[in-house]
Each structure stands twice: as structure tokens, then as C-alpha cells.
């Protein structure tokens, strides 16, 4: 039967009807509406927007729309005691101070409640000392400083450029190196594309622009005071000293005009190589301290931000399924922004709004999806994925039993070059099939499919004629669903040309200049890329909620498992002597992958042949597909990261944004040559191989015939 017959509605209500109802003009209108004032998490403005969205989703036709509130730890600057950084002379006089705010963009000069740039959750403090430039503050940058250059960061204030890795990892690395403060800045090498003007004349970062952001190392915990459990009315809260993931040293972000003033005086060691130089006209000396004439000058940080338990609000909308109401497909994206949120998150929220409107239109005409669709407008994503994580903690028992899929919907664009998709391998075929049916919005691809333009512009490194699909990492609201609960997840957005644009993210990310005008003037004047992203996200949700057999292909998991096993084996084989000495074998893992491949193949054959009119068998097969992702969850979690429980994927320990495969084995092998007790270290590698092999084998067995 077709999905239309299964839900007993008129045939015209198919995917095409849903997609045809999506309109670029509506997305544009919603984006404008969502970006006129700041919507910082925990503020009255963001509460009002939550209520507006609740009201509009009800009007659109959802069955119910509720606010789910939590009281979580947030962080704000002190309004009367601003944060800044000084250069002080030998007498302690401040001879230079960094800017207290970003110059507001044209048309926004009189907007109130623009939060000044700050690093959320920085502790208070006024450290002073010599500066050390640490490049991107990655693990390898500190290895270079400490091991090769013999530069000690202990007791120093470090200055690091944004980019390459999540800022929280930079701060963690600086703390471990003994630094007493961190200055983060945006170097034009990473946030200024050549040949493009700075805002408001183009989409580049001006010298006074600054990237805000949280600097937590939560590792999936959610609210720092209530890890594992919802921050509800009767929650037991940890003391601040026991809070999860808070930084221990002051941190503050600045723009490149201010960074120039700090970096131009740097003395000490020259940069180790050209990869440590940015685009400012400064020597990029590492330090420590200032050069000759300025050697008696020091840097002083003045940080007075406060951490406060504050109420946040998620909006949860429900469109009840007609056939399997106890199976949930979730579309979620956040609503809170650092300032106006022109791209992050409102370009995504506007798309979700239009998807809800389209589904609502179909529902008003008598249609229902086969499965229940949940729509979510998350709060406090910018403060550590708090809204989504608290809701998932509160509803974890329902989600682990009923969660079919989660589709994330943060920023719809980070460029306008081609599609970018990160998802579970279970969704590869869904994404391929869907994009073959959608029209490409790209210039030069008129009349061609999205699949074709995407494959041409972003080819898979492994399979010719196919597009690149990346691993899920973190840094967004899918984290709790995928990494903790094992619910199949995916995300899609339009992106830049990574080959020609080497800057990190998009230049105006988390700055005051992320406005409606930025999108409307420079990124997507016709909102055609937004519409395409709406079609991809909405189309995925439609298929996941409405197809009779879940559109998951377990054979694609088999393929990547083999690839990941090969990769981790080759990393381990860089130490052949130790592998021999400690009897390290990957046989169990490769055997488990082989078994998974064979069982997945047989399952796929049965999936083609079974009687789809038998609702019990249909439900049984779909449950095996739904629970496959869940089977990769280890209830004990990864070492020291109990909320990262997926054995195949986890956020990299060195960069939260990036996904790592077989993360348990990878982390056990990382820098193993420097471990003080090699026997213990290789023992942990063997244990992680055992855990991975067992998990893959156990997952394979969930696909076997049930009896």
C-alpha cells in the first residue's frame, strides 16, 4: 500500500503537496519577524517569542503546542561593571583598553539589550601577566609550544585565534597548560574572505566585530547543575564547585582591531612556521611577553560576568500520527540567539516555522502523518544545548522507546555554494533519494536535481558519483538525541565552498552584525537556498513520518563500520612493536563488522520480501530498523564522558564540533607514545576494541531473524 492509503487520506496529500506548500516568501517574512530584537536565552524577549511561536503553531493547525520550562545555569555580563582587557604599564596604569561593545550596525543604533561580547560561563577575575600567543589553542598547538618550543604557559595569559575547533576545547587546553586567562580573537585569516567587503557593505567581519559563545566542556551533560536529570521545580542542584564543565580561568573575546594592539607588541619566540601566522600586520611572535620597549608592560583582564539559574522555555508542538502515534519523528531547532540571530538560529527557525505551516495546511485538509511528528523550538542552545538536553532528560524513557528520528534545524545557511549534510548512515539513502527529487537552486544547474549540483560541488571522497555526507559531531541540539539516546539523527544546511574559503564558519557568526539584512542583501536575496533547505529538512521529516517501511538502510552502516575499522586499525598500526608486545588484535572487531555486514544484507533481503499488509510484521521490521541506532549505545558511556554513549560516533575529545569514529579506541590510542605506563595504556586500547567489537556484534544480532 502507499503511505496515503495507510493513513486513509486522499492521494493528493503526498510529499509533493507538502513540498509545494513551502514558500520562500514566507520564510523571508518569518526571518524578518524573528530578527528585529535580540532573543537572548533567559530574557523576557525570548519568552515572548516562545509564546508567539506557540500561538502561531496552534494557528497553523498542530494538535497541541506546549511550553516546557526549566531552570538552568546561564551566564551574563555585569551591566554596571563591564568586561574588558587592558595593557598596563609598570605602574599598573591602564594604557590601552579593549572595546566594551561592538559598534552597532546601521539601523540598530537605538536597539536596547544588545549583550556585549563575552565568553559565557567565564569565571570572574582580574588576572594580569605576560601574553603567550597559542595559535588556535588546539591540542597540537600546545604540543608544539610545550614539547618542541619548550614554552611554558603556566601563569601566563594566552591569546588564541578563533577557528578550527570549538572554543570550549581551546579553553580546556589552556587550563591544562596552566594558563591563568584566555583571550579569544577573530583573525581575518579565518573570518575575512578576500575580495569581500566588511559589514554593512559585505558579509565580512569588521575590525570591531566579536564572536560571542559559551566556553563550557559539558560533554553532553546539559544544565551544569543537574547532569542526567531535568532542571525542574524539584531538582536537586549541585553546588557551583561541583557543576559540570565550567571553566576555571577568566576568558574574554575581542575583535581584530583590539587583537592587533595586543599582538603587535609581542616578543619572545618567533612563530614556529607559517601556519601560526594570520593576516594581521603583526609578527605573530609567541612570547612570552612583549618586545623590548614594551617588556615592562603586562596584560590585565577584567571579567565580572555572573552565573545565574534562569528559567528557559522550549516550545513543543505535536502533530499526532494516524497509524503509529507512539512513534515520534522530531524536527527541532533553537530559538535563542546571541543578538539578532540573522543566521544563527533564525534562518533555521524561519524554515521550521514554514515546515510547520505546510504540515498544518495538509492537516487542516484532513491529512495526518502515519507517525507522530514533534516540532521543537529549543531555548538556551547557545549556553550549552540546554533546552533540548533538559527536555530529552525529562522525556528520555519515552524517547528511547518511541524515537524514530531527529532532524536538526539550526542555521539554514552558512554560505550559498552547495548543500551540506551530516547524518547517521541509516539516512544516507533517504537523503540521496530525496535530493534526486528536488530541484537545485544553484546557478548553472537550472533544471537539474539538487543531488546533481551537490555531488558536483561536494563529491564524496570515497564513492564517485555520490555527494559527501559527514559524520555527526556536536555543538548542536541533535547531541542528546544521537550521542546519548541513540536516536537516528541528521542535519542539513547550505554551506560555503570549503576549498576556496578557508575561514572558520561564516565571518559574522555570533556577532551583532548577524542581521536580517546580512541574509537578505548578501547570502540569499531570493531565499531560494532557504527554500531548498526547507525542502530537504521537511522532506526528510515527511518520509520518516509517513513511509510505511522506515527509510533506513542498515547496509550503509555496514559499509561505514568497515571503513572506520580500517581507519582505527591503521592508526594503531603506527605502533607495530607495541601491538606485538601487548598482543593487541583487531580480529574481534573485524569479525563483528563482517557479521554485521552479512546480517544487514540478509535483513535487507527480508525487508524487500515481507508482507507489508501484515501490521504486526511491519511493526516488527520497523522496530528493528528504529532500534538499530539504539543498539550502538553503551549504557556505561565513554571513559570520563558518561553522556556520550554511542560507541560508533562521539564528538572529538579535541573538537566538540567534529565527529570521531570508534571514539573509545581513538582516544585510547591518542598520544599513546607519551603515556607514562605503556602497559596500562595498551591495556585500555584492548578494552576499547573489546567494547567496540561486542557492541557491533550485539547491534548485528538485533537485525537477525527474531526467532
Amino acid at each position: 500500500k502507499s503511505s496515503n492509503e495507510a493513513t486513509n487520506i486522499t492521494p493528493k496529500h503526498n510529499m509533493k503537496a507538502f513540498l509545494d506548500e513551502l514558500k520562500a516568501e514566507n520564510i523571508k517574512k518569518f526571518l524578518y519577524n524573528f530578527t528585529q530584537i535580540p532573543h537572548l536565552a533567559g530574557t523576557e524577549q525570548n519568552f515572548q517569542l516562545a509564546k508567539q511561536i506557540q500561538s502561531q503553531w496552534k494557528e497553523f493547525g498542530l494538535d497541541s503546542v506546549e511550553l516546557a520550562h526549566y531552570d538552568v545555569l546561564l551566564s551574563y555580563p555585569n551591566k554596571t561593571h563591564p568586561n574588558y582587557i587592558s595593557i598596563i604599564n609598570e605602574d599598573g596604569n591602564e594604557i590601552f583598553n579593549t572595546s566594551l561593545f561592538e559598534p552597532p550596525p546601521p539601523g540598530y543604533e537605538n536597539v536596547s539589550d544588545i549583550v556585549p561580547p563575552f565568553s559565557a560561563f567565564s569565571p570572574q577575575g582580574m588576572p594580569e601577566g605576560d601574553l603567550v600567543y597559542v595559535n588556535y589553542a588546539r591540542t597540537e598547538d600546545f604540543f608544539k609550544l610545550e614539547r618542541d618550543m619548550k614554552i611554558n604557559c603556566s601563569g601566563k595569559i594566552v591569546i588564541a585565534r578563533y577557528g578550527k575547533v570549538f572554543r570550549g576545547n581551546k579553553v580546556k587546553n589552556a587550563q591544562l597548560a596552566g594558563a591563568k586567562g584566555v583571550i579569544l580573537y577573530s583573525d581575518p585569516a579565518d573570518y575575512f574572505a578576500p575580495g569581500v567587503k566588511s559589514y554593512p557593505d559585505g558579509w565580512n567581519l569588521p575590525g570591531g566585530g566579536v564572536q560571542r559563545g559559551n566556553i563550557l566542556n559539558l560533554n553532553g551533560a546539559g544544565d551544569p547543575l543537574t547532569p542526567g536529570y531535568p532542571a525542574n521545580e524539584y531538582a536537586y542542584r549541585r553546588g557551583i564547585a561541583e557543576a559540570v564543565g565550567l571553566p576555571s580561568i577568566p576568558v574574554h573575546p575581542i575583535g581584530y582591531y583590539d587583537a592587533q594592539k595586543l599582538l603587535e607588541k609581542m616578543g619572545g619566540s618567533a612563530p614556529p612556521d607559517s601556519s601560526w601566522r594570520g593576516s594581521l600586520k603583526v609578527p605573530y611572535n609567541v612570547g612570552p611577553g612583549f618586545t623590548g620597549n614594551f617588556s615592562t608592560q603586562k596584560v590585565k583582564m577584567h571579567i565580572h560576568s555572573t552565573n545565574e539559574v534562569t528559567r528557559i522555555y522550549n516550545v513543543i508542538g505535536t502533530l499526532r500520527g494516524a497509524v503509529e502515534p507512539d512513534r515520534y519523528v522530531i524536527l527541532g531547532g533553537h530559538r535563542d540567539s546571541w543578538v539578532f540571530g540573522g543566521i544563527d538560529p533564525q534562518s533555521g527557525a524561519a524554515v521550521v516555522h514554514e515546515i510547520v505551516r505546510s504540515f498544518g495546511t495538509l492537516k487542516k485538509e484532513g491529512w495526518r502523518p502515519r507517525r507522530t511528528i514533534l516540532f521543537a523550538s529549543w531555548d538556551a542552545e547557545e549556553f550549552g544545548l540546554l533546552g533540548s538536553t533538559e527536555w530529552a532528560e525529562e522525556n528520555s524513557r519515552l524517547l528511547q522507546e518511541r524515537g524514530v528520528a531527529y532532524i536538526n534545524a539550526d542555521s539554514s545557511i552558512e554560505g550559498n555554494y552547495t548543500l551540506r549534510v551530516d547524518c547517521t548512515p541509516l539516512m544516507y539513502s533517504l537523503v540521496h533519494n530525496l535530493t534526486k527529487e528536488l530541484k537545485s537552486p544553484d546557478e548553472g544547474f537550472e533544471g537539474k536535481s539538487l543531488y546533481e549540483s551537490w555531488t558536483k560541488k561536494s563529491p564524496s571522497p570515497e564513492f564517485s558519483g555520490m555527494p559527501r555526507i559527514s559524520k555527526l559531531g556536536s555543538g548542536n541540539d541533535f547531541e542528546v538525541f544521537f550521542q546519548r539516546l541513540g536516536i537516528a539523527s541528521g542535519r542539513a544546511r547550505y554551506t560555503k565552498n570549503w576549498e576556496t574559503n578557508k575561514f572558520s564558519g561564516y565571518p559574522l557568526y555570533h556577532s551583532v552584525y548577524e542581521t536580517y539584512e546580512l541574509v537578505e542583501k548578501f547570502y540569499d536575496p531570493m531565499f531560494k537556498y532557504h527554500l531548498t533547505v526547507a525542502q530537504v529538512r521537511g522532506g526528510m521529516v515527511f518520509e520518516l513520518a509517513n513511509s510505511i517501511v522506515l527509510p533506513f538502510d542498515c547496509r550503509d552502516y555496514a559499509v561505514v563500520l568497515r571503513k572506520y575499522a580500517d581507519k582505527i586499525y591503521s592508526i594503531s598500526m603506527k605502533h607495530p612493536q607495541e601491538m606485538k608486545t601487548y598482543s593487541v588484535s583487531f580480529d574481534s572487531l573485524f569479525s563483528a563488522v563482517k557479521n554485521f555486514t552479512e546480517i544487514a544484507s540478509k535483513f535487507s533481503e527480508r525487508l524487500q520480501d515481507f508482507d507489508k499488509s501484515n501490521p504486526i510484521v511491519l511493526r516488527m521490521m520497523n522496530d528493528q530498523l528504529m532500534f538499530l541506532e539504539r543498539a550502538f549505545i553503551d549504557p556505561l558511556g565513554l571513559p570520563d564522558r558518561p553522556f556520550y554513549r554511542h560507541v560508533i560516533y562521539a564528538p572529538s575529545s579535541h573538537n566538540k564540533y567534529a565527529g570521531e569514529s570508534f571514539p573509545g579506541i581513538y582516544d585510547a590510542l591518542f598520544d599513546i607514545e607519551s603515556k607514562v605506563d605503556p602497559s596500562k595504556a595498551w591495556g585500555e586500547v584492548k578494552r576499547q576494541i573489546y567494547v567496540a567489537a561486542f557492541t557491533v556484534q550485539a547491534a548485528a544480532e538485533t537485525l537477525s531473524e527474531v526467532a
Partner: antibody, heavy 120, light 112 residues
């Protein structure tokens, strides 16, 4: 828009000092260095030095060291250049120019110039 | 100090014809970050200089696209593809890679 407005023409005797001003508007004064450049028919354009309004740090051309002093008043968004022990060959048009910072690192805005005549 | 040498010092050109000015520095103008801080300024009669080209080849805002810059290391060129009457004036090359900043002697462009 960015504007640099300089003080009026000066006539000075040899051995005297002259102090010129340059008032900036249309941008954040402390973000951009102010350079002083003079122009004579004989020497062409000569960079005399610059000042960082943010911290008052100065960088002088060796040819003028000991005779030139650059200061600023951030409350007035004004930079000053004083040249002492004037000689007849200091007769020139003196320009202040904003150092354009990234991505230019060139003098992207110039004052209208101040003519200084040194004559006994 | 870095010496900047321009040629020719005088350049008579017919309207609509191209013009080219050369500038040579006494040492490399490549800064440690890989950028070359060689700029061109235009000074029209009775006016202050104004920035034309920055970092060898980048036109400053509002500069017509008939102006272009090229070169590397120590040898640089300013080209005007089709000279117009308003282009009359003196053109200076300048470097800000090394302190002190220095200028060329200037090339006077006039209409034949």
C-alpha cells in the same frame, strides 16, 4: 563618513616650535593609528611618524627624532604633532593620515593639509 | 631606509590610451605574514593624496576599475587601461612593510 580636519596655516621663525592638530570624525578614533606626512617640492612625501590613539604609543622616523612629539586627546578625537627647532627646510605642507588597519595597512584617509612656513 | 624609485617621473599620455608607472624598492616588501604592503596614491592638483591601490593589487573603494596594480617582491607596476582627463595628477608608490614608511618621488601624469 571618515574625516580628518587639520588646523590652519602657520608662519614660524627658525628655532621656534609649531603644534598642529588633526580632528577625526566618522569612526572610532582609538582603533586607527594617525600618521603625519609632510610634502616639500625637494623631498616629496616624507613619513614623520605615527601615534596609536588607543595607548598613545608613538613611532617616529629617525630623521625627526628629538624634534617631533606626537600626542592625542581621545576625549576630543584629536591628534597633535609638534615640531621643534624649526628650520627653513621644514617649510612644507603637513598632512595627518589615518592608518587604515586591516585589510589596508595603508593611509586610507588624509587631512586637507596644513601649510607651515618657516621664515625669518 | 627602504628607497622607492619610480619611473618615469613624467608621463605624457593621450586621452583613452593606456599608461604604466613602475616602482622599484631597494629591498623586498614581503612582510612575515606573506602580505606585501605596497600601495599607490593619487594626488590631484591642489588636493591631498588619496589611496588608490593597497597591497599591490587591491583597488580601494570608489576607485575606477581602469586602475590596476601588479608586481611582487621589489618590482611593482600601476596601470591605467584608458586614461581620462580626471586622472591628471601625481602618482606615488609607498611601502608600509618596513619602518620608516617611505614614498617614491612621484610620477606626474599629464595629457598630451
Amino acid at each position: 563618513q571618515v574625516q580628518l580636519v587639520q588646523s590652519g596655516a602657520e608662519v614660524k621663525k627658525p628655532g621656534a616650535s609649531v603644534k598642529l592638530s588633526c580632528k577625526a570624525s566618522g569612526y572610532t578614533f582609538t582603533y586607527f593609528d594617525i600618521n603625519w606626512v609632510r610634502q616639500t617640492p625637494e623631498q616629496g612625501l616624507e613619513w614623520m611618524g605615527g601615534i596609536s590613539p588607543g595607548d598613545g604609543n608613538t613611532n617616529y622616523n629617525e630623521n625627526f627624532k628629538g624634534r617631533v612629539t606626537m600626542t592625542r586627546d581621545t576625549s576630543k578625537s584629536t591628534a597633535y604633532m609638534e615640531l621643534s627647532r624649526l628650520r627653513s627646510d621644514d617649510t612644507a605642507v603637513y598632512y595627518c593620515a589615518r592608518d587604515g588597519n586591516f585589510p589596508y595597512y595603508a593611509m586610507d584617509s588624509w587631512g586637507q593639509g596644513t601649510t607651515v612656513t618657516v621664515s625669518s | 631606509d627602504v628607497v622607492m624609485t619610480q619611473s618615469p617621473l613624467s608621463l605624457p599620455v593621450t586621452l583613452g590610451e593606456p599608461a604604466s608607472i613602475s616602482c622599484r624598492s631597494s629591498q623586498s616588501l614581503v612582510y612575515s605574514n606573506g602580505n606585501t604592503y605596497l600601495h599607490w596614491y593619487q594626488q590631484k592638483p591642489g588636493q591631498s593624496p588619496r589611496l588608490l591601490i593597497y597591497k599591490v593589487s587591491n583597488r580601494f573603494s570608489g576607485v575606477p576599475d581602469r586602475f590596476s596594480g601588479s608586481g611582487s617582491g621589489t618590482d611593482f607596476t600601476l596601470k591605467i587601461s584608458r586614461v581620462e582627463a580626471e586622472d591628471v595628477g601625481v602618482y606615488f608608490c609607498s611601502q608600509s612593510t618596513h619602518v620608516p614608511y617611505t614614498f617614491g618621488q612621484g610620477t606626474k601624469l599629464e595629457i598630451k
